[in-house]
């Protein structure tokens, strides 16, 4: 829980807490911004990002963005607040412990994005259909 000496000295809205009143600590994410990638036509890929960061804000989750155009493939890894859009898209899967890629419509390129909320979960990005969250059994696993 929030220690009284901390609580008194700062506005409560600057400290994020969970339902039990425990202070929400930030998670760890791979954070290499945009890098060229060799990940293509695979069920899953590792990010090959060597930088693990403590997210700046406790509410932030891990995000990965995979993009392919005529010239190259890139993978972006960051922390991001799920209340805010990223690349103009809502992070609808932010509560997932795994980073399960979903295709998004972007003109001129193939664009996949995933978000997740466990430490370094954007290190392993999953494209395989067997992980699709339209499967109700998987939803049970994710949200238990």
């Amino acid at each position: 829980t929030i220690p009284p000496h901390v609580q008194k000295s700062v506005n409560n809205d600057m400290i994020v807490t969970d339902n039990n009143g425990a202070v929400k600590f930030p998670q760890l994410c791979k954070f290499c911004d945009v890098r060229f990638s060799t990940c293509d036509n695979q069920k899953s890929c590792m990010s090959n990002c060597s930088i693990t960061s403590i997210c700046e804000k406790p509410q932030e989750v891990c995000v990965a963005v995979w993009r392919k155009n005529d010239e190259n493939i890139t993978l972006e890894t960051v922390c991001h607040d799920p209340k805010l859009p990223y690349h103009d898209f809502i992070l609808e899967d932010a509560a997932s412990p795994k980073c399960i890629m979903k295709e998004k419509k972007k003109p001129g390129e193939t664009f996949f994005m995933c978000s997740c909320s466990s430490d370094e979960c954007n290190d392993n990005i999953i494209f395989s259909e067997e992980y699709n969250t339209s499967n109700p059994d998987l939803l049970l696993v994710i949200f238990q």
């Epitope: 829980t1 969970d18 339902n19 039990n20 425990a22 202070v23 600590f25 403590i54 238990q144």
Partner: nanobody, 122 residues
Framework: EVQLLESGGGLVQPGGSLRLSCAAS???????QMWWVRQAPGKGLEFVS?????????YYADSVKGRFTISRDNSKNTLYLQMNSLRAEDTAVYYC???????????????WGQGTLVTVSS
């Protein structure tokens, strides 16, 4: 009863060094994830550094990378923060905290020390 007691704070000039300690008792220190968290006057919490157990992997906020080093001595139940190349913006109350899952997914509990004040000023 879980207790965390920080020490080692004080007044230091910019560019100087300090070593903070956190003496832990009332729990099995060697199995816990431990953090240093700071709070500058009138500001929110900044999560400075984390050390895992087992394995001792360490992580740092971008603002302190390359300057601060977190470590632990499990035989002494003590957590440390070595702070070098200190800057005025490092002025804050520094807390050690422990955090672990309750077993319910996404739910954690945490314990905090009383904090130690670090002032960086010429």
């Amino acid at each position: 009863e879980v207790q965390l007691l920080e020490s080692g704070g004080g007044l230091v000039q910019p560019g100087g060094s300090l070593r903070l300690s956190c003496a832990a008792s009332g729990f099995t220190f060697g199995t816990e994830q431990m953090w240093w968290v700071r709070q500058a006057p009138g500001k929110g919490l900044e999560f400075v550094s984390r050390i895992d157990s087992p394995g001792g992997r360490t992580y740092y906020a971008d603002s302190v990378k390359g300057r601060f080093t977190i470590s632990r001595d499990n035989s002494k139940n003590t957590l440390y923060l070595q702070m070098n190349s200190l800057r005025a913006e490092d002025t804050a109350v520094y807390y050690c905290a422990k955090r672990r899952p309750t077993g319910v997914s996404g739910t954690f509990y945490d314990y905090w020390g009383q904090g130690t004040l670090v002032t960086v000023s010429s």
